[in-house]
């Protein structure tokens, strides 16, 4: 004989000894019908705020408050936004690799320094993790360009940037 709990919809719970579909109580949810209990809704507080409120069929979703970003599956923790010279990765904020920079506060990825030689210009001021290179005026007599090898942190090397 088929258990009538099998016919219960999401947003309800059902006990085998009394197989009646009952609505989830407030602040609980069930995304699958026929379960013996509803799950307690996630509460977004402190560094978290609600991205999606809880319903009888879906858990609440949290995001981080201004100035913080999510880490972990389903935004399990909040970390302070990255500073200039850093970019966000799965592990959190990481310093830009050699040859890249990020001048933004809190957002953005590390991007490569400008290649001054593309415009036939020299490097007036070398780049940092926070600032792009400053290109000088066009070079009149072109000397052969040299290649420097950039080895990103954790990487095998072999990325090239052209500098004059």
């Amino acid at each position: 004989v088929q258990n009538s709990c099998d016919n219960c919809q999401p947003g309800t719970f059902c006990r085998k000894y009394n197989p009646v579909c009952k609505s989830c109580p407030p602040s609980t949810f069930s995304s699958i019908g026929g379960q013996p209990n509803c799950n307690i809704c996630r509460v977004c507080a402190g560094y978290f705020r609600f991205k999606k409120f809880c319903s009888s069929t879906h858990n609440a979703e949290c995001e981080c408050i201004e100035g913080f970003h999510c880490l972990g599956p389903q935004c399990t923790r909040c970390e302070k936004d990255c500073r200039p010279g850093q970019e966000l990765t799965k592990q959190g904020c990481k310093t830009c690799s050699l040859g890249t920079f990020n001048d933004q506060n809190g957002t953005g990825v590390c991007r490569p320094w400008t290649n001054c030689s593309l415009d036939g210009r020299s490097v007036l001021k070398t780049g940092t993790t926070e600032k792009d290179v400053v290109c000088g005026p066009p070079v009149v007599s072109f000397s052969p360009s040299t290649t420097i090898s950039v080895t990103p942190e954790g990487g095998p090397g072999g990325h090239s940037l052209q500098v004059l």
Epitope: P73, K90, V109, C110, N115, P152, G155, L161
Partner: antibody, heavy 121, light 111 residues
Framework: QVQLQQSGAELAKPGTSVKLSCKAS????????IYWVKQRPGQGLEWIGN????????FYGEKFMGKATFTADTSSSTAYMLLGSLTPEDSAYYFC??????????????WGQGVLVTVSS | QVVLTQPKSVSTSLKSTVKLSCKLN????????VHWYQQHAGRSPTTMIY?????PDGVPDRFSGSIDSSSNSAFLTINNVQTEDDAIYFC??????????FGGGTKLTVL
């Protein structure tokens, strides 16, 4: 909506060059990396390199240094890849793809339709 | 040199559940995000899972992603497999934030 439109198929002779284009629309071209990916028929995906169109800065995979050259024209929101000194080994599909600026290890959210380059004498 | 290893081919039956693996040879699978792409013959890849376990809009909730640090692997699970799931699946992560790495791809055959 975001789109990456690539140029048509290329048939080239060994030793020559081809220039592939990838025209972006529906977003700010200068604010996202464009990646280039190679796929030989029936094979896996291989990173060639990437360009930041905002300043023309580039990175190349070790294997593709001297083989590929990236440029970007911000006025037409188009990224280009020049493939030089072609050999039959360069016969493949070439895709351009965009990476979001959320994190340094993010996915490629939009891809071009791919270009088949065939190198044959 | 970071390598992501995927089984060359996997066969499964219609309406079953299949779990595709992507093993990192060195380093920690938790260091960088893992993403999954589906590619049908003659088409460009499309994202099925991004940032380990997130599903883009329009991707059925039959698809889910997970990370297992004990086996240093990422997994793409497909429930209630459909004929349209017959495709090649690639995993994608990073060696450094400059250097993306792809798995060799798994050809999923739906019987």
């Amino acid at each position: 909506q975001v789109q990456l439109q690539q140029s048509g198929a290329e048939l080239a002779k060994p030793g020559t060059s081809v220039k592939l284009s990838c025209k972006a629309s529906g977003y700010t071209f200068t604010s996202y990396y464009i990646y280039w990916v190679k796929q030989r028929p029936g094979q896996g995906l291989e990173w060639i390199g990437n360009i930041w169109p905002g300043n023309g800065g580039t990175f190349y995979g070790e294997k593709f240094m001297g083989k590929a050259t990236f440029t970007a024209d911000t006025s037409s929101s188009t990224a280009y890849m020049l493939l030089g000194s072609l050999t039959p080994e360069d016969s493949a599909y070439y895709f351009c793809a965009r990476r979001p600026d959320y994190s340094g290890d993010d996915y490629f959210d939009y891809w071009g339709q791919g270009v088949l380059v065939t190198v044959s004498s | 040199q970071v390598v992501l290893t995927q089984p060359k081919s996997v066969s499964t039956s219609l309406k079953s559940t299949v779990k595709l693996s992507c093993k990192l040879n060195s380093g920690n699978i938790g260091s960088y995000y893992v993403h999954w792409y589906q590619q049908h013959a003659g088409r460009s890849p499309t994202t099925m899972i991004y940032r380990d376990d997130k599903r883009p809009d329009g991707v059925p909730d039959r698809f889910s992603g997970s990370i297992d640090s004990s086996s240093n692997s990422a997994f793409l699970t497909i429930n209630n497999v459909q004929t349209e799931d017959d495709a090649i699946y690639f995993c994608h992560s990073y060696d450094s934030t400059i250097t993306p790495v792809f798995g060799g791809g798994t050809k999923l055959t739906v019987l």
